[in-house]
């Protein structure tokens, strides 16, 4: 549900990833959107401590920009999703090995990955930076 408001990011986890003074979308389906979204990122972020140095910065950028989406202010504040191309690059290039392991473990029910269940968008459902450049955010 895309009901929410735009606000400056005031958290800690995504400080180094999000642009300074970035306007992010805070989702009012949470009682305390700022805290809830920060907790989501924090939980998934911990999983990223074990991934490869190639994957980690790309995954962190994807994670922060997916949970704290850029916000387009207006009469109806609107979240701007990540472009599908960036999403694909993180999943299939930068984090290909990690992604395979995570998918496999999740399918076999070995663990419930916070990152997998809560924090990773389905790339094919995202707008393309080529066909609709203003509809999505470039990382």
């Amino acid at each position: 549900d895309n009901k929410g408001y735009c606000a400056q990011y005031r958290g800690e986890v995504c400080n180094a990833v999000l642009a300074k003074d970035a306007l992010v979308f805070l989702n009012t389906s949470y009682a305390d959107p700022e805290e809830a979204q920060e907790l989501l990122v924090h939980t998934a972020w911990n999983e990223l401590k074990v991934v490869s140095p190639v994957c980690r910065p790309a995954a962190e950028a994807l994670l922060c920009n997916h949970i704290f989406q850029e916000c387009s202010p207006g009469v109806v504040p609107t979240p701007i999703p990540i472009c599908r191309e960036y999403c694909l690059a993180v999943k299939e290039l930068f984090c290909a090995k990690e992604w395979l392991v995570m998918e496999e473990k999740t399918h076999r029910g070995l663990y419930r990955s916070e990152m997998h269940l809560l924090s990773v968008p389905e790339c094919s459902k995202l707008p393309s930076m080529h066909w609709d450049p203003t509809a999505c955010a470039r990382l």
């Epitope: 694909l88 290039l93 094919s124």
Partner: antibody
Amino acid sequence: QVQLVQSGAEVKKPGASVKVSCKASGYTFTSYYMHWVRQAPGQGLEWMGIINPSGGSTSYAQKFQGRVSMTSDTSTSTVSMELSSLRSEDTAIYYCARELGWGSDYWGQGTLVTVSS
Amino acid sequence: DIQMTQSPSAMSASVGDRVTITCRASQDIRNYLAWFQQKPGKVPKRLIYIASNLQSGVPSRFSGSGSGTEFTLTISSLQPEDFATYYCLQHNSYPYTFGQGTKLEIK
């Protein structure tokens, strides 16, 4: 595993049209864009265009605009590329390729199209 | 359209040599550039993605660098199996465009 299987070689006369197909398997067909790239004998790679199989949006290189048409059939997981008004310079190997720049790239085996009178 | 100019178009080198191939874009493409290797009669194979990242399974003697308009592919110590044609591809915007290729031959 991901596979892209292209249709067989074609010999065409100048002025005719050719339709090359590319059948995808081993992945969710509608989740990935498909590119068409060609290579004339002894020449380099040339990007022709792209199709989003989910919905059929296309983008073509200027050079082929008006002469090329890319289509997708989700029921058979097949994309096709039709090139019309063929001339001898269109003699080339035509490749379909999934996600050239951004995701895991996979290529078809190539289809040789010969244009000769 | 963005033009990609590759240089040299052909070069000869010996096994063990360090080889550098350059690709120039006619406008800023950030780091959205890939490098492909093609051997005669084979389909192209991607070596480098997003300018400087090594594709899984590609030997570490291959490396890529650059951003904006100037990019390089380096092979640190040429092996017999590296003699092939190399292409750069910009994927910053449609239409995607390839460089004209660099044919690497044995000296």
